[in-house]
Interface confidence: low
């Protein structure tokens, strides 16, 4: 019993004056609390609590469920307790079967005893299964059995409290341990798409997936540099133990240009936080931007191939693409494909494959593309380089020798004189007249050049060479003539093509 020191409040005294009392089922429990400032008796066992304002607690016929802690409290808030065991051979355990344990913490299997004198109070696995090797526990007849440092592996473990009574093992009802995992990493967050491009009025919807070990992970969508609460909807699943997934979907039913910006999906748990962002760009109108992948002025040799390639950005998706030449639309020889397989791709490639181009096929090749909002076009000017061709080579009535050649780029005509029977015409002759003539063909066709020399300048037998050349090649025509007396004989022109 507590001793009384004058001038200082003391706890109440209880009769019988011992800390534990054992009674048999059916017997009377009589507890007396003595204190001038008596307030109440309180009874506690498991989650049950009862109060009594009488200073004497009397239970006429004790039951196993009357086992528990009886506390007397006075007006100073001081108290004294006695623990009563009501021994019932038919009910050795009082149980609260709810059993939750937080990972790495201790948890109590609540199976207090009604008889403190039984032996071997411990835990056993259900159906004779052994407990996990690393499971440690501490029995306390008044409270239950404390499992130390709960592991994630104990989740869904089936247990009994066990005692030995008169040489036999007696088991309580079964307990199923549910382990609440500790957060040992930040949540894993991901977003359905990293960027969105929309037109005004379209719906913006983005889903953030949050993965963690339990549903107590917190998550929210935030707009960067804004405190406005965003409207989001959740779906969640448990994909087995400690594998929880939540989908937080943010929706703006009719996006506006000023909704553009960065949206962050933020998640945190007791370990830390994680976030992922998505970018929304809202445009008031679609667009098409074309980027030529080769120079828009193209020079190609006669008979060779060329690929006209453009890349273009189109939003919304392109609906019509075509390549046009001389008001004629190509039905084949071209392909159009997305630059990337990414769902958010807006970049495309179009290629026109021109094969074995002829000198007559130079000109403007146009790529046109349109979507529901805009049209765009780009033109390529294709010049076909052709070796000069000598169109005419004549002696005119005025004694001039004239050579007319066509090709692209514009041919240059040089004249040479070969005296006698020499094969090499090395002495150059200056023309008296050079003109670039207008071609009757298309603007990208061959250029025609006319050059003339005065044959009266020649005093010896020989050959005159008219040589037309450009970057692609050269072609020659020859005028043979001889002197008879003081007169020139007939001039015989012939050509020799030099590759």
């Amino acid at each position: 019993q507590p001793s009384v020191s004058p001038g200082e409040p003391s706890p109440p005294s209880i009769h019988p004056g011992k800390s534990d009392l054992i009674v048999r089922v059916g017997d009377e429990i009589r507890l007396l609390c003595t204190d001038p400032g008596f307030v109440k008796w309180t009874f506690e066992i498991l989650d049950e609590t009862n109060e009594n304002k009488q200073n004497e607690w009397i239970t006429e016929k004790a039951e196993a469920t009357n086992t528990g802690k009886y506390t007397c409290t006075n007006k100073h808030g001081l108290s004294n307790s006695i623990y009563v065991f009501v021994r019932d051979p038919a009910k050795l355990f009082l149980v609260d079967r709810s059993l939750y344990g937080k990972e790495d913490n201790d948890t109590l299997v609540r199976c207090p005893l009604t008889d403190p004198e039984v032996t071997n109070y411990s835990l056993k696995g259900c159906q004779g299964k052994p407990l996990p090797k690393d499971l440690r526990f501490i029995p306390d007849p008044k409270a239950g059995i404390m499992i130390k440092s709960v592991k994630r592996a104990y989740h869904r473990l089936c247990l009994h409290c066990s005692v030995d009574q008169e040489g036999k093992s007696v088991l309580s009802e079964k307990f199923i341990l549910k382990v609440r995992p500790a957060f040992k990493a930040v949540p894993v967050v991901s977003v359905s798409k990293a960027s969105y491009l929309l037109r005004e009025g379209e719906e913006f919807t983005v889903t953030c997936t949050i993965k963690d070990v339990s549903s107590s992970v917190y998550s929210t969508w935030k707009r960067e540099n804004s405190q406005t609460k965003l409207q989001e909807k959740y779906n969640s699943w448990h994909h087995g133990d400690f594998n929880y997934e939540r989908q937080a979907t943010l929706t703006i039913s009719s996006a506006r240009v000023n909704d553009s910006g960065v949206f962050m999906c933020y998640a945190n748990n007791t370990f830390g936080s994680a976030n992922v962002t998505t970018t929304l760009e809202v445009v008031d109108k679609g667009f098409i931007n074309i980027f030529p992948m080769i120079n828009t002025t193209v020079f190609v040799n006669d008979g060779e191939n060329v690929d006209l390639i453009v890349e273009y950005e189109a939003f919304p998706k392109p609906e019509h693409q075509q390549w046009i030449y001389m008001n004629r639309t190509f039905t084949d020889k071209w392909e159009d494909y997305p630059k990337s397989e990414n769902e958010s791709n807006i970049r495309y490639v179009s290629e026109l494959h021109l094969t074995r181009l002829k000198g007559t096929e130079g000109g403007t090749y146009t790529f046109l593309v349109s979507n529901s909002d805009v049209n765009a076009a780009i033109a390529f000017n294709v010049y076909v380089n052709t070796k000069p061709e000598i169109l005419t080579y004549d002696r005119l009535v005025n004694g001039m020798l004239q050579c007319v050649a066509a090709g692209f780029p514009e041919p240059t005509i040089d004249w040479y004189f070969c005296p006698g029977t020499e094969q090499r015409c090395s002495a150059s002759v200056l023309p008296v007249d050079v003109q670039t003539l207008n071609s009757s063909g298309p603007p990208f066709g061959k250029l025609v050049v006319q050059s003339s020399i005065d044959s009266s300048a020649f005093k010896h037998n020989g050959t005159v060479e008219c040589k037309a050349y450009n970057d692609v090649g050269k072609t020659s025509a020859y005028f043979n003539f001889a002197f008879k007396g003081n007169n020139k004989e007939q001039i015989h022109p012939h050509t020799l093509f030099t590759p």
Epitope: S190, V191, V276, I309, K339, S340, N345, H353
Partner: antibody, heavy 123, light 107 residues
Framework: QVQLVQSGAEVKKPGESLKISCKGS????????IAWVRQMPGKGLEWMGI????????LYSPSFQGQVTISADKSISTAYLQWSSLKASDTAMYYC????????????????WGQGTLVTVSS | DIELTQPPSVSVSPGQTASITCSGD??????ASWYQQKPGQAPVLVIY???KRPSGIPERFSGSNSGNTATLTISGTQAEDEADYYC??????????FGGGTKLTVL
């Protein structure tokens, strides 16, 4: 089987030109991108550029643009990497690699690699 | 251009799981691939399109890619897995880039 065979090791002086090759076999050479990758001694991999042999469409890493030329001759299933004027800092192992079937330039994953060509530039 | 950051080295005991990360701005929005390179050899593709395994690559190699991090996971690591590992992605301009490489040591 798919093979990329590269030309042999080269020892050059600074200022010299060089063209190394990568010959593909066992697949349709024109329909797959070929990339060139540099690995300087004791360092990591660096993507230099890529070519589509069908039409010689090339893309260069900004770090290598203007420093090298990537080309291809589809008639002999060969891709080339060339320098007009070598520097000592061009000393490295150079690999060619192919984008796998079903891949595209957007998601390059190089499933077949050449054995590498070691280029040493020293005065 | 995207910059990819890898840890210079990772150590693992035989039979344990090795994780090699590759971080870069928003790389989860594009596909990542992973290469293994042993000394004196050309690189070998082990993962492409984030998590696909080429034929001939053991099932213990797996990949993931979300947010700013791509991860190569080798479960039940074996001594023969000791090598340099490189991640790679391609940006919107179609330029590829490799990570700096991670040396995996099997203890």
């Amino acid at each position: 089987q798919v093979q990329l065979v590269q030309s042999g090791a080269e020892v050059k002086k600074p200022g010299e030109s060089l063209k190394i090759s990568c010959k593909g076999s066992g697949y349709s050479f024109t329909n797959y991108w070929i990339a060139w990758v540099r690995q300087m001694p004791g360092k990591g991999l660096e993507w230099m550029g890529i070519i589509y042999p069908s039409n010689s469409y090339t893309l260069y890493s900004p770090s290598f643009q203007g420093q090298v030329t990537i080309s291809a001759d589809k008639s002999i299933s060969t891709a080339y990497l060339q320098w007009s004027s070598l520097k000592a800092s061009d000393t490295a192992m150079y690999y060619c690699a192919r984008v796998p079937p079903g891949g595209s330039i957007s998601y390059p994953a190089f499933d077949h690699w050449g054995q590498g060509t070691l280029v040493t530039v020293s005065s | 251009d995207i910059e990819l950051t890898q840890p210079p080295s990772v150590s693992v005991s035989p039979g344990q799981t090795a994780s090699i990360t590759c971080s870069g701005d928003n790389i989860g929005s594009i596909y990542a691939s992973w290469y293994q390179q042993k000394p004196g050899q050309a690189p070998v593709l082990v993962i492409y399109r984030d998590n696909k395994r080429p034929s001939g690559i053991p099932e213990r190699f797996s990949g993931s890619n979300s947010g700013n991090t791509a991860t190569l996971t080798i479960s039940g690591t074996q001594a023969e897995d000791e090598a340099d590992y490189y991640c790679s992605v391609t940006d919107m301009e179609q330029h590829s880039v490799f990570g700096g490489g991670t040396k995996l040591t099997v203890l």
